[in-house]
């Protein structure tokens, strides 16, 4: 019976027309939701002007529905038995999951000033760009409203910088109308054990921001895993939003309506420093923000983001060394609110649950040449918000589940 | 070594214009900015602008603004400066000079211009 | 615009004497003064830049001290191939400006 149930479950994992995993796996049969909490900025004036320590209050959650369009691209390669891909992104905002709206203003750090006074360092350009700071009356904090923040505004110092660059800053811009990829990932047909694992990414096995083995395209996109998961398993995925591959390690069992699921989890470990964990010795890519790579639980990003120094975290600082949190007031982290966690089905390998939580910052540093950065006696990463995208099966989805699977098993 | 070397000298006929080069050597160029001092005959130092050889962007003193035009060739490592409508006033020796972390640490031997009918 | 002020325009001292030339700004540049060497047919050479940190090679009998609006050049014994012309420049706003100069000769 085991052996039959095993052959069902390689047949309906395969990515390839006609069956259940590819249907889910082209248009996800669960509705995923990303919510935001904003990090608003209580004492802008205290902190330029004293370089006190900035007291943030998060407000949200602010919620869109995501990840409802289906795969675009889609053609299968029978040759090295892999299928590709293009992930599209919409963001549509649901009112009844907010506190809120969209026009609700936010005091935040002004993105392009915090950015343009780290990529151009030469003072000569850094004194170019405090006559333009100065003239466009922008300073180290900005108000913006939620939809400017996350999806794009005009930035009127960079409307006025006399060479070309993008003027138009947001968090996730562009979002709407653009896609993720393209991915090639193995289609199983050949090899069960290779299923969803991604071969390349935008045409390539390696990422080329980080040293080593830093640099890998490992695992999945964690939307599912190769059938027959065990415990002792290390799950290596890929995650696009932060420009790494990371993994989760098992924690305990869950019943997820009345589905028996691994609950997998991101350990502290992945976000330790090279000290604590060698392993991680190549996400440590400069020495005085990160105090030689003994800070730990914030992972540099800027070389994934055109040399914008944005750093990457979970929320509320959660696993980061104190050094990090030390000059924000106003976060409390906790495992429970803030850690990522995938609740896997382990004989077909699926993500039947999760909640991805992550936390976007900014590096702002002293500037001796721009006047609104002149003040500041040290760097700062600087929360803008955190987010939790969250995904469950549905009941129907569930009970079909239950009854063509876990069912049948037991 | 850290070189910047200058064209020649140039005499021009007022109303015509004219293009000073400055190819430099001996570092990454486009991690330093270039930049432009006049020197009237036995008279003091004047900025006239300097640029980011990454991405051309350029700033002038107000009243050089009509008068010089600045240019680099990443290529080559070599920026210009062109100097239009020229008259007797814009006789004098003109210096390029590098520019990072210090101001002007390292210049060219300079070029001197005469104009004159 | 910063104008700078430089005095005296002209010095005429004796070998080892003491030498002291100020520039004053019009506007606050905290301490971004540079002082330049010029001989006669050569480019200026940077002695001392920002913050009245002495550039490397440069001889310590040249010192620089000020902040703000009013600062202070000086050679502390005076040898003749000291003999050149020296200017100020201000690197804290655009444009950045000199000063006027001042002509050092032997007494």
């Known amino acids: 019976g085991d052996l039959l149930i095993q052959k069902t479950i390689k047949k309906q994992v395969v990515l390839e027309e006609g069956t259940i995993a590819f249907k889910n796996w082209v248009k996800t049969g669960t509705e995923v939701y990303r919510q935001f909490w904003i990090f608003d900025v209580q004492n802008p004036q205290e902190v330029m002007m004293n370089s006190s320590n900035i007291q943030v209050k998060q407000r949200g959650p602010y919620t869109y529905r995501v990840r409802f369009l289906a795969k675009e691209n889609v053609t299968q390669d029978a040759e090295d038995n892999t299928v590709s891909f293009l992930q599209p992104n919409g963001a549509i905002f649901e009112p009844s999951l907010s506190v809120g709206t969209e026009a609700d203003n936010f005091t935040v750090l002004n993105l392009a000033v915090a950015a343009a006074s780290h990529i151009y360092q030469n003072q000569f350009v850094q004194m170019i760009l405090n006559s333009l700071i100065n003239k466009s009356k922008s300073s180290m904090f900005q108000v913006r409203t939620l939809r400017e923040l996350l999806w794009g505004y005009r930035d009127p110092f960079l409307s006025l910088v006399p060479y070309p660059v993008t003027t138009t800053v947001g968090l996730f811009y562009p979002y709407n109308n653009t896609a993720d990829g393209v991915y090639k990932v193995f289609n199983g047909k050949d090899n069960i054990s290779k299923v969803a694992i991604i071969d390349t990414y935008k045409g390539k096995r390696n990422l080329s921001y980080w040293e080593s083995h830093c640099d890998m395209i490992n695992g999945t996109d964690a939307a599912s895993f190769p059938p027959f998961v065990e415990k002792s398993q290390v799950l290596q995925f890929f995650s696009s939003d932060i420009c790494r591959s990371i993994y989760a390690v098992f924690e305990s069992d869950v019943n997820l309506k009345g589905i028996p699921v691994y609950r997998f989890v991101l350990p502290s470990k992945a976000f330790a420093s090279p000290v604590e964990n060698p392993d991680n010795y190549c996400f440590c890519t400069e020495k005085i923000i990160s105090k030689n790579c003994t800070s730990y639980g914030v992972l540099d990003i800027s070389k994934c983001k055109e040399g914008r120094p944005v750093y990457i975290s979970l929320p509320h600082f959660l696993y980061a060394s104190p050094d990090v949190s030390e000059p924000i007031d106003g976060l409390n982290p906790n495992e429970e609110e803030h850690r990522t966690y995938l609740d896997i089905e382990p004989i077909t390998g699926f993500t039947l649950q999760f909640a991805k939580r992550l936390q976007v910052n900014l590096l702002v540093k002293p500037s001796e040449k721009i006047q609104v950065l002149k003040n500041l006696k040290r760097n700062y990463i600087v929360p803008i918000l955190w987010l939790n995208e969250t995904g469950t099966i549905g009941d129907e989805k569930a009970n079909m589940f239950r009854s063509q699977v876990t069912g049948k098993i037991n | 070594e850290v070189q910047l070397q200058q064209s020649g000298p140039e005499l021009v006929k007022p109303g015509a214009s004219v293009k000073i080069s400055c190819k430099t050597s001996?570092?990454?160029?486009?991690?330093?900015?270039i930049h432009w001092v006049k020197q009237s005959h036995g008279k003091s130092l004047e900025w006239i602008g300097g640029i980011i050889p990454n991405n051309g962007g350029s700033s002038h003193k107000q009243n050089f603004k009509d008068k010089a035009t600045l240019t680099v060739d990443k290529s080559s490592s070599t920026a210009y400066m062109e100097l239009r409508s020229l008259t007797s006033e814009d006789s004098a020796v003109y210096y390029c000079a590098r520019a990072g972390d210090y101001a002007f640490d390292y210049w060219g031997q300079g070029t001197t211009l005469t104009v004159s009918s | 615009e910063t104008t700078v002020t430089q005095s005296p325009a002209s010095l005429s001292m004796a070998i080892g004497e003491k030498v002291t030339i100020r520039c004053i700004t019009s506007t606050d540049i905290d301490d971004d003064m540079n002082w330049y060497q010029q001989k006669p047919g050569e480019p200026p050479k940077l002695l001392i830049s920002?913050?009245?940190t002495l550039r490397p090679g440069v001889p310590s009998r040249f010192s620089s001290s000020g902040y703000g609006t009013d600062f202070v050049f000086t050679i502390e014994n005076m040898l003749s191939e000291d003999v050149a012309d020296y200017y100020c420049l201000q690197s804290g706003t655009l444009p950045f400006t000199f000063g006027s100069g001042t002509k050092l000769e032997i007494k």
């Open positions: 001996g570092y990454t160029f486009t991690e330093y900015t």
């Open positions: 920002e913050g009245n």
